[in-house]
């Protein structure tokens, strides 16, 4: 059950998709990837206040217990709900190959 | 790709399964659940240092970018990799029914 999408902390402060520009060097990929030289990495960043984009029952439980025991139970965390595939041109022993990765770029986000 | 299971922060400090005992009142369930009266909630708690139990390529990217831009990109987060089902005896308008929830108790954990 995806719960409320209204962020009580103010616009853009809660769990949502962000894009971070990263070079192959930033990612530690320079030795095994040829292209792209730069990746627009989409990732999930932001706070998960009570019931905001709660992914499931577990997230709802976590919210309740975090409220009761904040030092023991962390708040839900903003993570990908799904991914967009991305193709990389990789270096191989013999040259190059194209490889599609299904778990590289976040497509949308939820709290869990 | 589940990466290393060795915790560099010391035993029990990294992402792993914890059990938290919670009453129906703690969970905010007292008005709609009859049984159980208490739940042994299994949840994922702990730090996600570099490559520890990295769930996928996205988690590895997040680790790299967090190292570069710690104020912008958060470290990976400890979340359920899978769940154990649980049955609840629920109050209904007319009485009770049994409902199995597949997303309530964490079974194992990874970093994402």
């Amino acid at each position: 059950a995806r719960n409320g999408d209204h962020c009580p902390l103010g616009p853009g402060r809660c769990c949502r998709l962000h894009t971070v520009r990263a070079s192959l060097e930033d990612l530690g990929w320079a030795d095994w990837v040829l292209s792209p030289r730069e990746v627009q990495v989409t990732m999930c960043i932001g706070a998960c206040p009570s019931q905001f984009r709660a992914a499931n029952m577990h997230a709802q439980i976590k919210t309740s217990l975090h409220r009761l025991k904040p030092d023991t139970v962390p708040a839900p965390c903003c993570v990908p709900a799904s991914y967009n595939p991305m193709v990389l041109i990789q270096k191989t022993d013999t040259g190059v190959s194209l490889q599609t990765y299904d778990d590289l770029l976040a497509k949308d986000c939820h709290c869990i | 790709a589940r990466n290393g299971d060795h915790c560099p922060l010391g035993p029990g400090r990294c992402c792993r399964l914890h059990t938290v005992r919670a009453s129906l009142e703690d969970l905010g369930w007292a008005d709609w659940v009859l049984s159980p009266r208490e739940v042994q909630v299994t949840m994922c708690i702990g730090a996600c240092p570099s490559q520890f139990r990295a769930a996928n390529m996205h988690a590895q990217i997040k680790t790299s970018l967090h190292r570069l831009k710690p104020d912008t990109v958060p470290a990976p987060c400890c979340v359920p990799a899978s769940y154990n089902p649980m049955v609840l005896i629920q109050k209904t308008d007319t009485g009770v029914s049994l409902q199995t929830y597949d997303d309530l108790l964490a079974k194992d954990c990874h970093c994402i």
Partner: antibody, heavy 118, light 107 residues
Framework: QVTLKESGPGILKPSQTLSLTCSFS??????????VGWIRQPSGKGLEWLAH???????YYNPSLKSHLTISKDTSRNQVFLMITSVDTADTATYYC??????????WGQGTTLTVSS | DIVMTQAQNFMSTSVGDRVSVTCKAS??????VAWYQQKPGQSPKALIY???YRYSGVPDRFTGSGSGTDFTLTISNVQSDDLADYFC?????????FGGGTKLEIK
């Protein structure tokens, strides 16, 4: 759709061992909170609870029969077993298995009849 | 063991009537009582959980009440289909125990 079905030998002689199987579908004994119990009923009489096994392999027995009873399960095959050693004529009854989530027997099998006779 | 006593072995009633089946526990069982119906030649069926909550699919003619030691199953507007044995069960402590049953006869 939840179903349970008991199977047993039908007839035994005194001092023999009774082995009962409960085969079920529509639920899983790997689900937290789920259990299966055995209850028996002599013809024309009341119900007597015998044993219960839980998802986490906790087992509970009726103290009056405990030394004779063993309950076990095969979660992957959706089966629960009850063994009663040294049966006598007082064990003649219909034996039921029932789904027992949090102590509530909401689904029962059709029962299997045991006659103990020399 | 907790003894569950159903004082009336038999009760006779007519279609359309209201009838109350009682059950007494030998010690406090809070509301940890269930009721079951067993029609002739059939296995028991769940009616009531936690003393007063009807199980899903059970007609609202069946009502459970009570706590502590005294419990009642009330059937209002009795139907001919209600001809059955009715058993109470406590699940407050092991071993689970059942009442001896009350056979409802329809005049």
């Amino acid at each position: 759709q939840v179903t349970l079905k008991e199977s047993g030998p039908g007839i035994l002689k005194p001092s023999q061992t009774l082995s009962l199987t409960c085969s079920f579908s529509g639920f899983s004994l790997s689900t937290s909170g789920m259990g299966v119990g055995w209850i028996r009923q002599p013809s024309g009489k009341g119900l007597e609870w015998l044993a219960h096994i839980w998802w986490n392999d906790d087992k509970y027995y009726n103290p009056s029969l405990k030394s004779h009873l063993t309950i076990s399960k095969d979660t992957s095959r959706n089966q629960v077993f009850l063994m009663i050693t040294s049966v006598d004529t007082a064990d003649t009854a219909t034996y039921y298995c029932a789904r027992g989530a949090y102590d509530f027997f909401d689904y029962w099998g059709q029962g299997t009849t045991l006659t103990v006779s020399s | 063991d907790i003894v569950m006593t159903q004082a009336q072995n038999f009760m006779s009633t007519s279609v359309g009537d209201r009838v109350s089946v009682t059950c007494k526990a030998s010690q406090n069982v809070d509301t940890n009582v269930a009721w079951y119906q067993q029609k002739p030649g059939q296995s028991p069926k769940a009616l009531i959980y936690s003393a007063s909550y009807r199980y899903s699919g059970v007609p609202d003619r069946f009502t459970g009440s009570g706590s502590g030691t005294d419990f009642t199953l009330t059937i209002s507007n009795v139907q001919s289909d209600d001809l059955a044995d009715y058993f109470c069960q406590q699940y407050n402590t092991y071993p689970y125990t059942f009442g001896g049953g009350t056979k409802l006869e329809i005049k």
